[in-house]
Interface confidence: low
Amino acid sequence: QLSLPSILPNENEKVVQLNSSFSLRCFGESEVSWQYPMSEEESSDVEIRNEENNSGLFVTVLEVSSASAAHTGLYTCYYNHTQTEENELEGRHIYIYVPDPDVAFVPLGMTDYLVIVEDDDSAIIPCRTTDPETPVTLHNSEGVVPASYDSRQGFNGTFTVGPYICEATVKGKKFQTIPFNVYALKATSELDLEMEALKTVYKSGETIVVTCAVFNNEVVDLQWTYPGEVKGKGITMLEEIKVPSIKLVYTLTVPEATVKDSGDYECAARQATREVKEMKKVTISVHEKGFIEIKPTFSQLEAVNLHEVKHFVVEVRAYPPPRISWLKNNLTLIENLTEITTDVEKIQEIRYRSKLKLIRAKEEDSGHYTIVAQNEDAVKSYTFELLTQVPSSILDLVDDHHGSTGGQTVRCTAEGTPLPDIEWMICKDIKKCNNETSWTILANNVSNIITEIHSRDRSTVEGRVTFAKVEETIAVRCLAKNLLGAENRELKLVAPTLRSELTVA
């Protein structure tokens, strides 16, 4: 049994300033999601993203870039696998208020103004304020109605049939809602309508199938509204199921679909004996032919540090379902021979996510990686170059005497990615070379000393320093460095005169 997710900030409610940004973090022992007040069409400024941390918990962040009155409401964080259609969402909640002096009440959809009361049950008239401090009164045709008010829900009470208006005053300005209409229904007269479309994306020539089912009701009139309706393209069928309970299944079939059949498919059920109407809608899109869109979440040149773990995520939209494969340097990735894995996950009906995972980046992982997505109608690819960044290291430091001239050349070979930079230092007092202050950087413009640098390949560089004449023993230091690290080595240069004396001895 998982403990409930937790939310930061750890508060039951929070008041957020209008037009400011806010973020809510949810931590759970399994994958977590957010449910929030607005519909998907309205939520362009709500961003949900996953975050990694070292706690071992799953973290999902909800970010609102510019808070408005419509963001007022209950934000629920829940475990993905616990969400079911029937029960109320189980999770952790925080209620956000966004007070707006020009919007006293949280905007509602038209259906919210229809309040159904079954028998003599209590009901809620859902006028919620954007500011918890705003006083609200409820009115009907007879005047003020006594009912308990909760700014998170609205007025709760037993209401007679008819129109009700909520009224609030903010900074001396009076606000009124449009009327809430309270209807009374017998509990059994509820219209239970479900719509099902196994697919919402098709291509030309395929058959569109949409069903609507009405439960526990026999006296129902159901109408279809859809793009091909005027041409009489659709075939409608009704199937009556009586066991274990009454269920009317209406099926709309549109054969040989074309692009013009794209649009909203709506079923509207009306109870013949009452003014009870329920509508369900699904948007169907028909494409001329199959398609593929690739959207990488990274650029065409990516760098990774040696031994780093890195994921490259590519979003793919495709229909029909694509085959997704990865190539390295135009060859198929053989996963069992490398510490590189790939996977593909279906996110939605036509949305897929493919991941290329580098477990511990190695130098040989550098190269061009390509994701290829293909179906019977299209093929798309995206290629990026991966560069494994390696700290610089010195491979070799040697000197070379120029015979009788007394000149000497020191060669320093280093490798790393990005290509290391080579710097030379010199210590003229050999007895004091243990002291760092005795070393000086060798400038390019010193007479009798020539420094040069040559790139041998993409990751190896050779630096040379030539001394026209070495008259006394000196120490030379090669320092190779790049963004990831530095290494140095030292070498003693003995003057030719001293060397000959040593030889005689």
């Epitope: 940004s21 869109e293 760098a303």
Partner: antibody, heavy 117, light 107 residues
Framework: QLQLQESGPGLVKPSETLSLTCTVS??????????WGWIRQPPGKGLEWIGT???????YYNPSLKSRVTISVDTSKNQFSLKLNSVTAADTAVYYC?????????WGQGTLVTVSS | EIVLTQSPDFLSVTPKEKVTITCRAS??????LHWYQQKPDQSPNLLIK???QSVSGVPSRFSGSGSGTDFTLTLNSLEAEDAATYYC?????????FGQGTKVEIK
């Protein structure tokens, strides 16, 4: 409210290095969601993307300027910087810094840099 | 690099008129095309993102459409404050590029 502010000299001599800094306030440059970029606009002309940096230091440059551009980030100061070396009169432009996640949603007010001796 | 070509370069329009600006990409860029408005001596301002998505705070008279290579910015019932230069921008393939701009003048 997120704000970006460019700063740096308004006049640079030819062949010298143009250096600008963008200070971010009202939000963290270390956000793992966003990248930080430089765009320029020569007088009376269109917009040109120069390059972009992520808070970790990963950089992406426009190939037409790559050999002359360096963009760096200082998360402790909530700043990122642009260096463009070996400038010529053709580099005279208004330089903007901006935040983006594929879309440039917040921009600085821009600073005019003139290259002239 | 992807070249974005806007048309027309210049428009002179009377208030309340409908304005359409097109942007054509030199290769397929999916829907990662965005529109910006720039008024004289101001920074560009994001109008439409991902070809057709509206942006908070932008008047509803601005809308966008298109995918693949051909995109459209529509201004329904132009107002005096809409006098500006409009740029399209793609963020599909590096280097990110902008269109050359369309200047809209109010008669």
């Amino acid at each position: 409210q997120l704000q970006l502010q460019e700063s740096g000299p308004g006049l640079v001599k030819p062949s010298e290095t143009l250096s600008l800094t963008c200070t971010v306030s009202g939000g963290s440059i270390s956000s793992s969601t966003y990248y930080w970029g430089w765009i320029r606009q020569p007088p009376g002309k269109g917009l040109e993307w120069i390059g972009t940096i992520y808070y970790s230091g990963s950089t992406y440059y426009n190939p037409s300027l790559k050999s002359r551009v360096t963009i760096s980030v200082d998360t402790s100061k909530n700043q990122f910087s642009l260096k463009l070396n070996s400038v010529t009169a053709a580099d005279t432009a208004v330089y903007y810094c901006a935040r983006h996640h594929w879309v440039f949603d917040y921009w600085g007010q821009g600073t005019l840099v003139t290259v002239s001796s | 690099e992807i070249v974005l070509t806007q048309s027309p370069d210049f428009l002179s329009v009377t208030p309340k008129e409908k304005v359409t600006i097109t942007c054509r990409a030199s290769q397929i860029i999916g829907s990662s095309l965005h529109w910006y408005q720039q008024k004289p001596d101001q920074s560009p301002n994001l109008l439409i993102k991902y070809a057709s998505q509206s942006v908070s705070g932008v008047p509803s008279r601005f809308s966008g459409s298109g995918s693949g290579t051909d995109f459209t910015l529509t201004l329904n019932s132009l107002e005096a404050e809409d006098a500006a230069t409009y740029y399209c921008h793609q963020s599909t393939i590096l280097p990110w590029t902008f269109g050359q701009g369309t200047k809209v003048e109010i008669k």
